[in-house]
């Protein structure tokens, strides 16, 4: 194949791959007709002048995961056809000025996972056709004004995992075609007003895992095409009333892991396309009426691990499409009987790890499609008669770790659990807490003949049983919804070669193994 170096493999498709620790310099001679060259996992430490001079047809060059720490300015001379250049996962601290001169066709430049300390406007001034620039995983502390001014065609810019402490409001001003901007895992404490004003085509903005405390009210007002906004794991304590008002295309918004104390009505919206809203791990204490009413298409709402003690009866107004609601690990003691009434499409609700002492009998009255209910680890002593009778799709109900009072009033619940058991999850069985003579016994195998009579009502009406599937030949499939109920933290949907690591925290949702987060 036109002389393939012994350390490399060359394919008929003009692809050359050179790998191995024995390689300490760019192998020669390289086939003149090579269109793709990969130099991976070698011990090459430097690139000298023009090592690729004779392969001018090259379109893609990947020099990754090497020991590369020094590059001569003329290393890429004569590669006028090159469209893709990756120098990711090396040990570069400095880029020589003019290194990319002459790469007139270059569209993708990957410099991620190096040790770059700074970039200058002159570095990319020749790259007028560049569409993708990956700089994440370096040691950049600031971006000088003008650094990207010549990259007017850029659509994707990743500056994540650096050490940026501030961003100039002018640094992105010429990037009118930018669709993806990632600034995650830096040390940003605030974003100046106007920073994103020029980004009229921006679709994704990743700001998670910084130290942002305040958001300017109009920070996103020019970003009408924004679809994904990641603000999680910052120090945001309040949301200006209008901060999200101009984001009609938004379909993913993450705010978990901040310091939000309250949410004012109308703060979200209108966002007719928002499908998921992640608010866990904040300091929210109450939910007022209509706080989510603009989110007509919302399907996943995660409010777990806050300090919510009060939910107004109309807090969930407008959420007619909601499928998953996570309220676990809060401070709820009581719920209004109408609080879930509008959630006609709700499938999974997690209420575990609260302080619920009782539930209204109509709490799930209009939520006929519920498949999973998590009520474990509350202060429940009994449940109202008939509370689950109409829930024909319920196949996971967790009731353990409550102080069940096993007097004669518990019989309806016990009977309901027994008669419907093949439809429910096989989790830990509820155990009696009182009276003392049955403490520790399983609620469903207590000896009913020694159950203490209830002190308040002599006749215990029971759950109008209607075993969930009356008169059916056998119970339907009992597949657990676990796999859809315990979502992990939302993985920001990145497609870079270097992906973002997101903590897989399965305790967040607490709904079922797939429903954490």
């Amino acid at each position: 194949y036109h002389g393939c170096p012994s350390e490399c493999t060359c394919s008929r498709a003009s692809q050359v791959e050179c790998t191995g620790a024995r390689i300490v310099a760019v192998p020669t001679p390289l086939p003149w007709n090579a269109m793709s060259l990969q130099i991976l996992n070698t011990h090459i430490t430097e690139l000298n002048e023009s090592p690729f001079l004779n392969i001018s047809a090259l379109i893609a060059l990947r020099i990754e995961k090497n020991e590369l720490s020094r590059i001569t300015p003329g290393a890429f001379r004569n590669l006028g056809s090159l469209r893709y250049l990756s120098l990711a996962n090396n040990k570069l601290q400095v880029l020589p000025i003019g290194l990319f001169q002459g790469l007139d066709s270059l569209e993708s430049l990957l410099l991620s996972s190096n040790q770059l300390l700074q970039i200058q406007p002159a570095h990319f001034s020749q790259c007028s056709n560049l569409k993708e620039l990956q700089l994440h995983g370096n040691h950049l502390e600031y971006i000088p004004d003008g650094a990207f001014d010549h990259l007017v065609g850029l659509t994707k810019l990743n500056l994540g995992k650096n050490s940026l402490t501030h961003i100039s409001p002018r640094v992105f001003q010429h990037l009118g075609n930018l669709q993806v901007l990632r600034l995650y895992e830096n040390r940003l404490t605030d974003i100046p007003m106007g920073t994103f004003d020029g980004l009229v085509n921006l679709q994704e903005l990743a700001l998670q895992q910084n130290q942002i405390g305040l958001l300017s009210p109009g920070l996103f007002h020019n970003n009408h095409n924004l679809q994904r906004l990641y603000l999680s794991n910052n120090h945001i304590s309040q949301l200006p009333p209008s901060v999200f008002m101009q984001l009609p295309q938004l379909n993913r918004l993450t705010l978990f892991g901040n310091s939000l104390k309250e949410l004012s009505p109308g703060i979200f919206g209108p966002m007719p396309n928002l499908r998921e809203l992640w608010l866990y791990d904040n300091h929210i204490s109450s939910l007022p009426d209509n706080v989510f009413s603009n989110l007509r298409q919302l399907q996943v709402l995660i409010l777990s691990r806050n300090q919510i003690s009060f939910i107004s009866p109309g807090a969930f107004n407008g959420l007619t499409e909601l499928r998953e609601l996570s309220l676990h690990t809060n401070a709820l003691q009581d719920l209004d009987g109408n609080v879930f009434r509008m959630l006609a499409n709700l499938q999974n609700i997690s209420l575990q790890n609260n302080r619920l002492r009782q539930l209204p009998g109509n709490i799930f009255a209009n939520v006929n499609g519920l498949m999973a209910i998590q009520l474990q680890n509350n202060q429940l002593e009994n449940l109202p008669l008939g509370i689950f009778d109409h829930l024909g799709k319920l196949c996971e109900l967790r009731l353990y770790d409550n102080p069940w009072r096993c007097d004669s009033d518990i019989l309806p619940l016990r009977n309901w659990l027994l008669l419907n058991q093949p439809r429910l999850g096989t989790d830990t069985v509820p155990v009696c807490f009182s009276p003392a003579n049955v403490r520790g016994q399983s609620l469903i195998i207590i000896n009913v003949n020694v159950a203490v009579p209830s002190v308040h009502v002599p006749e215990v009406p029971s759950y109008p049983e209607t075993p969930w599937y009356p008169d059916t030949p056998s119970y339907p499939d009992t597949t657990s919804v676990s796999s859809t109920t315990e979502l992990t933290s939302p993985v920001e949907d990145y497609t870079d070669l270097t992906t973002i690591q997101v903590t897989d925290d399965r305790s967040v949702w607490g709904m079922t193994q797939a429903q954490s987060g």
Epitope: L418, P422, T426
Partner: antibody, heavy 113, light 111 residues
Framework: QVQLVQSGAEVKKPGASVKVSCKAS????????IHWVRQAPGQGLEWISY??????KYNERFRGRATLTSDKSTSTVYMELSSLRSEDTAVYYC????????WGQGTLVTVSS | DIVMTQSPDSLAVSLGERATINCRAS??????????MNWYQQKPGQPPKLLIY???NQGSGVPDRFSGSGSGTDFTLTISSLQAEDVAVYYC?????????FGGGTKVEIK
């Protein structure tokens, strides 16, 4: 004390129906399931159905032939079995609770032409 | 349907000796970590009487010499010291799922 008292023996012709009653006393009627079980002469036990606050569940073998009803005012459960055949000759028992902790004395139903 | 198979069909044991009856289910009768296996005693001309529920829990008024054990598919009823009044037919039953099914019975006699 808990008692389940069943109606007396019946003799029926093939194709006819029979309705057996089970009157409960000594406990809160609405708090417990009532099952029906039958036992053919010299044979084992066969579960037919249960009723709990008007909700019912049937053994497929008896679907369409067995009907359970209850009268809360008299704490009585009824089992009607239709389209009788000779192999339905058996003692029919009612039993209380999910775990069948108390049983009626049984009702002998004889199906004979 | 879950099929319950009892063994032996009949058993003759001397007074004061141990009697053991086995019951095997065609599939597991465990749920919630509980085995939904029950045992009944039936004497001639009488209705059955609940002895053991949920594999190992004694029914009301049942003498301590009756005990149950097992989980999953294999279960045992043990009479630790057979008395004359224990002569009867013993049935196992699963209540994990409808239709609730009984074993064919084991007749216990005195040797």
């Amino acid at each position: 004390q808990v008692q389940l008292v069943q109606s007396g023996a019946e003799v029926k012709k093939p194709g006819a129906s029979v309705k057996v009653s089970c009157k409960a006393s000594g406990y809160t009627f609405t708090s417990f399931v009532i099952h029906w079980v039958r036992q053919a002469p010299g044979q084992g036990l066969e579960w037919i159905s249960y009723i709990y606050n008007d909700g019912t569940k049937y053994n497929e073998r008896f679907r369409g032939r067995a009907t359970l009803t209850s009268d809360k005012s008299t704490s009585t459960v009824y089992m009607e079995l239709s389209s009788l055949r000779s192999e339905d000759t058996a003692v029919y028992y009612c039993a209380r609770d999910y775990y069948f902790d108390y049983w009626g004395q049984g009702t002998l139903v004889t199906v004979s032409s | 349907d879950i099929v319950m198979t009892q063994s032996p069909d009949s058993l003759a044991v001397s007074l004061g000796e141990r009697a053991t009856i086995n019951c095997r289910a065609s599939e597991s009768v465990d749920y919630y970590g509980i085995s939904f296996m029950n045992w009944y005693q039936q004497k001639p001309g009488q209705p059955p009487k609940l002895l053991i529920y949920a594999a190992s829990n004694q029914g009301s008024g049942v003498p301590d010499r009756f005990s149950g054990s097992g989980s999953g598919t294999d279960f045992t009823l043990t009479i630790s010291s057979l008395q004359a009044e224990d002569v009867a037919v013993y049935y196992c039953q699963q209540s994990k799922e409808v239709p609730y099914t009984f074993g064919g019975g084991t007749k216990v006699e005195i040797k």
